[in-house]
Amino acid sequence: LADPLDHRDAGDLWFPGESESFEDAHVEHSISRSLLEGEIPFPPTS
């Protein structure tokens, strides 16, 4: 399936007071990632 976003890197965003980077979660919760779930494991982040 086409995957517009390459999910190898994580962490575009950071909001003070939040426990995680927004972009980390955004990538994990993107349409592109949802299409890949169950087909390949999450690649490790560097």
Epitope: F15, S21, A25, H26, H29, I31
Partner: antibody, heavy 114, light 112 residues
Framework: EVQLVETGGSLVQPGKSLKLTCATS????????MHWVRQSPEKQLEWIAH??????????YYAESVKGRFTISRDDSKTTIYLQMNSLKEADTAIYYC?????WGQGVMVTVSS | DTVLTQAPLSVSVTPGESASISCRSN???????????LYWYLQKPGKSPQLLIY???NLASGVPDRFSGSGSETDFTLKISEVETEDVGVYYC?????????FGPGTKLELK
């Protein structure tokens, strides 16, 4: 095939309300964070609202221009997101897109005019 | 707010030649882990925006490699190495680093 289909646009008078619907298909919906972005007649794109997933307590975020007037929501069982728009202003006239920022719907026109 | 400005606002290119579009941010778009949150979209006439470049320099799936993105923390460039007819439309930069998310005003690309 990923599909995002917006409906509910129309011509409304200032001060009135309107509810937009974005029906999605072709991908597992419940874990996806969704957004509404609008495009003014001058073609400027403006992000207006964002809703997270159930695991994030359906947290929502809004642009100042719509905060207190617009409400984004979702129904995971129907794989659908909504945008309830109240106290509409002429400045809200735009094409409204639902998007995951990677995939976009075709858009729906909302015209606010007396 | 994070304000994005683009230049030029309109560009006319001969097919086969290269084109460059600039996007400047009033704030750094460098996030944690050295990820730069600058995205490029193309909106073809009568269509919805489509993702071209994410995180400043990464090509989205299905996008021809004649498109490339580069830049620093506040200054960014989209380059099209050999413009084709299908590249006509309005190019927008966007940032997803800070709320509210913002888009540039767009650059209209036309063919000579």
């Amino acid at each position: 095939e990923v599909q995002l289909v917006e409906t509910g646009g129309s011509l409304v008078q200032p001060g009135k309300s309107l509810k937009l619907t974005c029906a999605t298909s072709g991908f597992p919906f419940s874990n996806v964070w969704m957004h509404w972005v609008r495009q003014s007649p001058e073609k400027q794109l403006e992000w207006i609202a964002h809703i997270k997933a159930k695991s994030d307590n359906y947290a929502t975020y809004y642009a100042e221009s719509v905060k207190g007037r617009f409400t984004i929501s979702r129904d995971d069982s129907k794989t659908t997101i909504y945008l309830q728009m109240n106290s509409l202003k002429e400045a809200d006239t735009a094409i409204y897109y639902c998007t995951g920022l990677d995939y976009w719907g075709q858009g729906v026109m909302v015209t606010v005019s007396s | 707010d994070t304000v994005l400005t683009q230049a030029p606002l309109s560009v006319s290119v001969t097919p086969g030649e290269s084109a460059s579009i600039s996007c400047r941010s009033n704030k750094s778009l460098l996030g944690i882990r050295d990820i730069t949150s600058l995205y490029w979209y193309l909106q073809k006439p009568g269509k919805s925006p489509q993702l071209l470049i994410y995180r400043m320099s990464n090509l989205a799936s299905g996008v021809p490699d004649r498109f490339s993105g580069s830049g620093s923390e506040t200054d960014f460039t989209l380059k099209i190495s050999e413009v084709e007819t299908e590249d006509v439309g309005v190019y927008y930069c966007a940032q997803f680093l800070r709320y509210p998310y913002t888009f540039g005003p767009g650059t209209k690309l036309e063919l000579k």
